[in-house]
């Protein structure tokens, strides 16, 4: 099972992480990151089964992202559109994840160096007019066989946990306190 | 090419150690973790272990806990795995292996480690 | 720590035949999944890993298939340099682990 954000194992990259990816950038709606039964990927107001995600470090600061209902990897064309694929392409499917201070990542494609952001409004499928990054935060994500608590309207606290943490984050990124040993 | 070179085979007596070096090259040695593996004679494999090479940060199969002990020198590209208090059990060929999200996509030629008095 | 049992521990088959191995995990570990190919004397090579996904430079006639805790490995016309042992491996969550092994033997 994914272990408790407290776990020292989160210091290495083996273990998988159970995430709500949310967005609140200026730009566009506050959203979780969904992966759809269609292939087609999106944001939700809510936190929903589409947007549980599964995090899990490929290499040193790389990681890859599947949605735990549908079984499809998070992916990116060269123009920036995401899909979500049963097959994972390692060229289409790797991300970089960084740090900021403020305890959000950005996740760039590795392949190609294309930040990750919700596609606008207006298409389903791609943003006709890219920006800079999207800041997500990672919040985390009960397993699949328990029930969202009821009754809890507070939002949950954010993780700033990175898949790993202590290898690949340069100078320019945040480092978060919660690892600090 | 990717590649993997581990040493020779090693003949230890009963509650010595040995280390294991695997020297790695065609990539970048800090852009993947390095693991090891056992297979004991005509039996399956066990995951020993996997270590950062950026960091020195490992995480080991419990089962190994005592046992195994792993470093990487990122100066040689070299990652090295120590046994200590060997016994007969440990009879077996030790794999260095390459993780790519813990599947294992390159691997060294294999260590035989003979434990006898 | 996550079991896993492969089926059947060995197998006689002829070249052009398919061959399917099957692998069971003791809980649901999603896509993660991989199988690996070891000959006689020689170091395991990846062939699969994420369930479906090739690992470089392996032939097409290899796939991979299931999910949650159920997966086979499927070799359509077995060639001569195919027959050696498999082994399937979660890559979950640490540790590990490997299923026992199938041996795929010249009938």
């Known amino acids: 099972h994914p272990i408790p954000d407290s776990s020292p194992l989160l210091q290495f990259g083996g273990q998988v992480r159970q995430r709500y990816l949310y967005t609140d950038d200026a730009q566009q709606t506050e959203a979780h990151l969904e992966i759809r039964e269609d292939g087609t990927v999106g944001g939700a107001a809510d936190q929903s089964p589409e947007s549980l995600l599964q995090l899990k470090a490929l290499k040193p600061g790389v990681i890859q992202i599947l949605g735990v209902k549908t079984s499809r990897f998070l992916c990116q064309r060269p123009d920036g559109a995401l899909y979500g694929s049963l097959h994972f392409d390692p060229e289409a499917c790797s991300f970089r994840e960084l740090l900021l201070e403020d305890g959000y990542n950005v996740y760039q494609s590795e392949a190609h160096g294309l930040p990750l952001h919700l596609p606008g409004n207006k298409s389903p499928h791609r943003d006709p007019a890219p920006r800079g990054p999207a800041r997500f935060l990672p919040l985390p994500g009960l397993p699949p066989a328990l029930p969202e608590p009821p009754g809890i309207l507070a939002p949950q606290p954010p993780d700033v946990g990175s898949s790993d943490p202590l290898s690949m984050v340069g100078p320019s990124q945040g480092r978060s306190p919660s690892y600090a040993s | 090419e990717v590649q993997l070179q581990q040493s020779g085979p090693e003949l230890v007596k009963p509650g010595a150690s040995v280390k294991i070096p695997c020297k790695a090259s065609?990539?970048?040695?800090?852009?993947?973790?390095m693991g090891w593996v056992k297979q004991s004679h005509g039996k399956s494999l066990e995951w020993i272990g996997d270590i950062n090479p950026n960091n020195g940060v490992t995480i080991n199969n419990q089962n190994f806990k005592g046992k195994a002990t792993l470093t990487v020198d990122k100066s040689s590209s070299t990652a090295y795995m120590e046994l200590r208090s060997l016994a007969s059990e440990d009879t077996a060929v030790y794999y260095c292996?390459?993780?790519?999200?813990?599947?294992?996509?390159?691997w060294g030629q294999g260590t035989s480690v003979t434990v006898s008095s | 720590d996550i079991q896993m049992t492969q089926s059947p521990a060995s197998l006689s088959a002829s070249v052009g035949e398919t061959v399917i191995i099957t692998c069971r995990a003791s809980?649901?570990?999603?896509?993660?999944l991989a199988w690996y190919q070891q000959k006689q004397g020689k170091s395991p090579q990846l062939l699969v890993y994420?369930?479906?996904t090739l690992a470089e430079g392996v032939p097409s006639r290899f796939s991979g298939s299931g999910s949650g805790t159920q997966f086979s490995l499927k070799i359509n016309s077995l060639q001569p340099e195919d027959f050696g042992s498999y082994y399937c491996q979660h890559h979950y969550d640490s540790p590990w682990t490997f299923g026992g092994g199938t041996k795929v033997e010249i009938k």
């Open positions: 994420n369930i479906r």
């Open positions: 065609g990539y970048t040695f800090t852009d993947y973790y």
């Open positions: 809980e649901n570990i999603y896509s993660y």
């Open positions: 292996t390459r993780g790519y999200g813990g599947a294992l996509d390159y």
